[in-house]
């Protein structure tokens, strides 16, 4: 015998109190598949969460985070605060990047400045907390009468401090 509830489409539920008639989901609830015996309560996007997509009878609401926060977790289950450029988020809040490191985004960690000398280049623009250094031509290229042939880059050695 076929289950009469299997005929109930998404957006309805099989109402046992009414001889298994397919009843529409009540307000603020949904069923995303057919044959459901109950409808699920819609997610509410409150506080630091804001509504990205309204709940409908066939699909749950979707949340994202208010400005100043970004989503974490499946389906944006959590909101993590943004930091300013030049900072990183630590367990105790936003902290400025240490000297020699930078972060050009509102999330993530501070990264060391590029070490230009590892590629045989000079520093063209100094780094800041918000920006990496800009490497220029190699010192040899800047000397008068220098050959246009770029010398091979030295082998990378571990442990060089950023410059």
């Amino acid at each position: 015998l076929q289950d009469p509830c299997s005929n109930c489409p998404a957006g309805t539920f099989c109402d046992n109190n009414r001889n298994q008639i397919c009843s529409p989901c009540p307000p603020n609830s949904f069923s995303s598949a057919g044959g459901q015996r109950t409808c699920d309560i819609c997610r509410q996007c409150k506080g630091v969460f804001r509504t990205r997509k309204e709940c409908s009878s066939t699909s749950n609401a979707e949340c994202d985070c208010t400005p100043g926060f970004h989503c974490l977790g499946a389906g944006c289950s959590m909101c993590e605060q943004d930091c300013k450029q030049g900072q990183e988020l630590t367990k105790k809040g936003c902290k400025d990047c240490c000297f020699g490191t930078f972060n050009d985004q509102k999330r993530g960690i501070c990264r060391p400045w590029t070490n230009c000398s590892l590629d045989g280049k000079s520093v063209l623009v100094n780094g800041t907390k918000e920006r990496d250094v800009v490497c220029g031509p190699s010192p040899a290229d800047l000397s008068p009468g220098a050959s246009s042939v770029t010398p091979p880059a030295p082998a990378r050695e571990p442990g060089h401090s950023p410059q």
């Epitope: 988020l89 630590t90 367990k91 105790k92 960690i109």
Partner: nanobody
């Protein structure tokens, strides 16, 4: 598949206690530091406490120091958070999280897996 499942949340009166548990599966539990993080209504994530893989190093947010105790039982693949002297401001969804290495600190977030969370409500 790595999974973290929190339990133990509920409604408690101010000054009361609760113990949260986090059952871990899908990875070698003792090799990784673990962290509790919470999200109060209308607020962003707040780090609560972290413990190293071996359990010998623990760290706490100033807001919970002296009231909360983090611990782990590596033989049961379970993380705990004992919460005493609870206050209204401790009301939040509490998430258990796996860090990426065995060591931890009170500085970097190094979280790569989150649980689904358990709700703690402190109210009279």
């Amino acid at each position: 598949e790595v999974q973290l499942l929190e339990s133990g949340g509920g409604l408690v009166q101010p000054g009361g206690s609760l113990r949260l548990s986090c059952a871990a599966s899908g990875f070698t539990f003792s090799n990784y530091a673990m962290t509790w993080v919470r999200q109060a209504p209308g607020k962003g994530l707040e780090w609560v406490s972290s413990i190293s893989g071996s359990g010998d190093s623990t760290y706490y947010a100033d807001s919970v120091k002296g009231r909360f105790t983090i611990s782990r039982d590596n033989s049961k693949n379970t993380l705990y958070l004992q919460m005493n002297s609870l206050r209204a401001e401790d009301t939040a969804v509490y998430y258990c999280a796996k860090e990426g290495t065995g060591t931890t600190s009170d500085y970097y977030y190094n979280v790569d897996v989150w649980g689904q969370g358990t709700t703690v409500t402190v109210s009279s």
